[in-house]
Every structure is written in C-alpha cells, then in structure tokens.
Interface confidence: low
C-alpha cells in the first residue's frame, strides 16, 4: 500500500517539510504531486518522469519544491498557506494509478507575548483585574505563571477567552505578581516579560512601638507609628485629642508627669481613603510599677547530652514586660542551638550538650523596674558508648 | 439569615410598564452582584440581567434588551427591574437572586420567593 | 431552545444513584464553572452545586457535581422521596455575555 509521511507533521513558518513517500512500486512511468486530497490538474505542483527523469512544474508550483525519483517532495520555506492535504498520484507501468494523501500543519513562529490589564492599580478587596494575553493567535495554548509558578487551584482566579484571558477576582495586597504568560503552539513556545500589579490597600490598624507604658520624668519619649499601606500612609498624632504633628515619629525630649495621656496615631491612605487609630496610653510617673518575680520552668531537668532537647519556660502575669536569658551570668543565647520564641518566654536547646550543665534563669523588666526568677539547675548525662561487636584482632 | 423579596408585579396591559423591587437583609447588599431570573408559567429558568456590586457593569440576556433595565440603591438594600414595552412572553414569576462572584463568574446563592407578572389584555 | 441542554425527565426509586447530564459548548461550559440548581414543587430554586463540584454547606454529599470538557452532570446517590424535583444546571457564556440555564430535568422517585 502506497503511504506518505510528513517529515516533520508539524512544521515551524519558514521551516522545511519533507514528504516521505513509502510503497512506492517498482514499475512506473511516472508520478505527481497535487495540493488537496484528490486529483486535480489545476492544482498540481510537479510531475516527474521516471524515463527521462525530467520534473514538470505544475500550476500550483511555488518554485520551493523539490522532487526527488523516490518521489518524495520537499517543501523550502512554508507559509501557514502550506498547511493542509498533499496527494500523491503514481502512474505504474501497468497504467493503474494508485493515490496516496497526506498532510502538515505549519505553525507561526511564535512572537514574545505582552501583558494587558484593565487596572494595573486596583484597590484591594474591591476591585478585579483581567490580565489578558496578547496577540490572540490562531491554534496557541495560552498559559499563566504567577510568582514563576503555574496557577494554583483558587476560587479567586479565573480563566476564559480560551485561557487568553485571568480575572483576578477581588485582589489582595498579596497578589502584586509577578505575573507573565507563556504562549505555545506545536513548534515553538515564548513568554512575555513579567509584569506586577500595584495593589492600592490599607492603612491596616496602625502600631505604636515602643510597647512601654511607664516612663520616668525626665526621659525622652519617642514613638513611632506604622501601619501597612499602598501607598504608604500619612500619620499623625494627637495627644488627649488635640492634634500635634503629621510625622510617623513623635518625640518629646525631657518628659514630665504632664505628659501622661493619651496618644494617638492617625494613619491615612489618601488613595483608598481609609482612616485607621490607634491609642496608647503613656504613664510618667516616680512610682514603680513592680514587676512580680516570674516562674521558671522545664520540660525536664536532667537531660541525655547530643541527644535530647529542652525547653525552659518564663511565666508572669505582668503586661507591657520584656523577657531576658541569663546562663552562668550571661546572656543569652549564645549558640545556634538555642533559640528564643514567643516572645522571649520559651528557650529552646537542641541538642543539649555538656557545656549546657549549670544554672537558668529569666529576668522580666519594663522600662521602670525588673524581676528576675529563681534559677533552675539543668544537668546533662552522657551514655557510656556501646561495645564494638566483633572479633578483635591476634 | 439572607431575605430577599420581591415586590411590584401584578397584571399589565401589552405594551404597558412595571417597576419590580427586591429587598435585601440580612449581609452587606453592597459587596454582592444581583441578578433578576425568570419563570414563565410551566417553563424552566431564564437569567434576565445582572448588576454587579457598585452598579458599574451590567448584562441582558438578549430578549429583554432595549426593554427591561436593571438597576440597584446600595443605600436602601434595593435591586429594581424597570419594565417597558411588555409582551405576552414577558409573563412569568421574576425571582431575584444574590450572586456571591460579585458577577464575574456568576451563580445564585439565595433566591427570593418570586413575583408574578402577567401581560394580558 | 436551551443554549444547555438536560434530558427533560430521569427517574429512580429510593436508594437508587441517579445521573442528570448537562452539555454545553466551549463557550459556557468549557470555559466556565457549573452550577446546579434544584427547585421543589412550588417553591423558588436552591443552590445544589457550584464551582462545577462544591457543595454549599447544607447540601447532603449524596449530591455530588462533575464537568469533563464541555459537559456537565449532577450525581444523586442513596435517592429520597424528597429529591423529586426539578434540577437545572448554569453557567455564564463568554459569545452571549450572559448566564445560560439548561431547560431543566424534572426528576421523578418512584414507588
């Protein structure tokens, strides 16, 4: 049976195709090439003649083919006007014909995709954005990549217009991007230049740092105000409510009893037109706030060195403290294997190791007075080593 | 608890006009995309128009256009469907649905109780 | 003539899995998500399915929604008496710029 192939099926514009030709028949006179899926004069590309191996353009000829006598037929330099059915018709000696068809698909040499966006400054929690692909192209897979990844499974996003086209619904400050998208078609793939989204959001609940709240007379008050914003918010600041400066710090040098009160910080975001406050009461005063003396606990005390781990605990009551670590009257922690967390009130070793033997403990102070816990006696045992089995030598 | 109800319907001449309302209660009528859906009598569903959340886009199913105009009052938690130049077709019970997409990949969540509006001479 | 279309009747008795398919195009279906609705004798239509499989809550998980392609169907298990309804399913359509519904399944429990 007489068969073609295309060599390659899927063929890049501007690249070459070659129509392989299997089956062919020993006796003939002679061959052709037509454009379409049947026989058809007018549209015939090239006749060959085995006897005086002359080729014979035909009136669809573009002058890019080639014949060669095993009656396969190149293609130079295809256009998508290529694409379609080819038909062999082979004229044998006995002067039955027999036909075969084949075909390819020429595909664009895909340009480097661009981005478009109905909002690239959306508002968050209010507003959608639809990122569209571009060009549209005929016969192209369009995908998405969100922070250089593919899209995750999320009610939010939203693909149509063939993928051409991601809705973003209701945007947050997380989904600045960056976004790029990648289109591909059989023989070739590219992707645009990455593109971000200013989310517009905020001012969030603004905070006041430091946390203390007792000052001595005489000490110098700074505050600073923060609150998350796009753009960045304005601040200001009252004092018991009367207005006193547009800056994010306050600082009042040399403070007196007079200055207690109550400070707030405005935080505003003239985009979005959201207001936030926060309040903070200061207390200047001579007496001291005393710290009650914290709890010290472990996890366990007497401990497997290189092998176990263990976690020292500082418990108190009090509000608006700090914590601190001492070990052997220094501070910690002093190793990588010791790390602080919530808020200062867990120490975490691991693993625990000889030089970690000897005495904890935990201070907690305000800016007026501090406390400290009785000490805890961590001891660290090791494990006589095992016993080589075996048979010793001699 | 989600209400909606529909009000405004009742028997019209061809050619005549109706304004239906649909109250909303019970969640923030200003963050939903609102939609008007259509029963003739012994039929099934027809979606009739949406209006998204702040009223900027709006669509019509292609029978209603140039004829029904869908509109909302964020202050009074009020979807309203004006209704001109009225055909026989145009009978059916007009229910009014939330759509928690804000109308960008739309669905009914909560539907009201209906409203019947007959053209007849 | 729904622009989805849903086979007009399904029945089953009680206990029984019954199946209600919905087919579209690549204009609503293929590129949108599905809905179901379910609407008792008399009463206004209730979300049964959206998001093609999700189910709000109150909605039992013997009513389960799939979509392969450009079709859609809505899967009834352990059949009641009370799930003899109508069930439509929808989805927006990017040609028309609007939400289509099937023409609707009237689903019959027999026995």
């Known amino acids: 049976q007489l068969t073609t192939e295309s060599m390659p099926f899927n063929v890049a514009e501007g690249k070459e195709v070659l129509l392989l030709v299997h089956n062919l028949p020993q006796q003939l006179f002679g061959y052709s090439w037509y454009k379409g899926e049947r026989v058809d004069g007018n549209r015939q590309i090239v006749g060959y003649a085995i006897g005086t191996q002359q080729a014979t353009p035909g009136p669809a000829n573009s002058g890019r083919e080639t014949i060669y006598p095993n009656a396969s037929l190149l293609i130079q330099n295809v256009t998508q006007n290529d694409t379609g059915f080819y038909t062999l018709q082979v004229i044998k000696s006995d002067l039955v014909n027999e036909e075969a068809t084949g075909q390819f698909h020429v595909y664009p040499e895909l340009p480097k995709p661009s981005i478009s966006s109905n909002n690239s400054n959306p508002v968050e929690d209010k507003d959608a954005v639809a990122f569209t692909c571009e060009p549209e192209t005929q016969d192209t897979t369009y995908l998405w990549w969100i922070n250089n990844q593919s899209l995750p499974v999320s009610p939010r996003l939203q693909l149509s217009n063939g993928n051409r086209t991601l809705t973003l619904l209701s945007v947050t400050r997380n989904d600045t991007g960056p976004y790029e998208c990648e289109i591909q078609n059989p023989v070739s793939a590219n992707r645009s230049d990455p593109v971000t989204l200013n989310v517009t959001y905020g001012p969030d609940t603004p905070t006041i740092s430091p946390s203390d709240t007792y000052y001595r007379p005489g000490a110098n008050l700074s505050l600073s105000c923060y609150a998350a914003s796009n753009p960045p918010a304005q601040y200001s600041w009252l004092i018991n409510g009367t207005f006193q400066q547009s800056t994010q710090e306050l600082f009042i040098p040399n403070i007196t009893v007079n200055n207690s009160g109550s400070y707030t910080c405005h935080a505003n975001n003239s985009v979005t037109g959201c207001n936030r406050t926060t309040v903070k009461t200061i207390i200047v005063t001579e007496l001291s706030p005393v710290v009650a003396k914290p709890q010290i606990k472990a996890s366990k005390t007497t401990v497997t060195g290189d092998k176990d781990s263990v976690n020292l605990t500082c418990s108190t009551n009090d509000t608006g403290i700090s914590i601190r670590w001492f070990f052997k009257n220094q501070s910690l922690p002093s190793s990588e294997r010791m790390k602080l967390s919530q808020g200062n009130t867990t120490l975490s070793i691991n693993p625990v190791k000889r030089e970690d033997a000897g005495t904890y403990w935990c201070e907690v102070f305000n800016p007026i007075s501090k406390n400290q816990s009785d000490p805890i006696m961590l001891n660290v045992n090791y494990n006589a080593l095992p016993q080589e089995n075996g048979l010793s030598p001699g | 608890e989600v209400q909606l109800l529909e009000s405004g319907g009742g028997l019209v001449q061809p050619g005549g006009s109706l304004r239906l309302s649909c109250a909303a209660s019970g969640f923030t009528f200003s963050n939903y995309a609102m939609s008007w859906v259509r029963q003739a009598p012994g039929k099934g569903l027809e979606w009739v128009s949406v209006i998204s959340h702040g009223g900027g886009s709006i669509y019509y199913a292609d029978s209603v256009k140039g004829r029904l105009t869908i509109s909302r009052d964020n202050s009074k938690n009020t979807l309203y469907l004006q209704m001109n130049s009225l055909r026989a077709e145009d009978t059916a019970v007009y229910y009014c649905?939330?759509?928690?997409?804000?109308?960008?990949?739309?669905?009914?969540?909560?539907w009201g109780q209906g409203t019947l509006v007959t053209v007849s001479s | 003539q729904s622009v989805l279309t849903q086979p007009p009747s399904a029945s089953g008795t009680p206990g029984q899995r019954v199946t209600i398919s919905c087919s579209g195009s690549s204009s609503n279906i293929g590129n949108n998500y599905v809905s179901w609705y379910q609407q008792l004798p008399g009463t206004a239509p209730k979300l049964l399915i959206y998001a093609d499989s999700r189910r709000p809550s109150g909605v039992p998980d013997r009513f389960s929604g799939s979509k392969s392609g450009t079709s859609a169907s809505l899967a009834i298990s352990g059949l009641r008496s009370e799930d003899e309804a109508d069930y439509y399913c929808g989805a927006w359509d990017l040609s028309l710029n609007g939400y289509v519904f099937g023409g609707g399944t009237k689903l019959t429990v027999l026995g």
């Open positions: 649905a939330r759509d928690p997409t804000k109308g960008y990949a739309p669905l009914f969540d909560y």
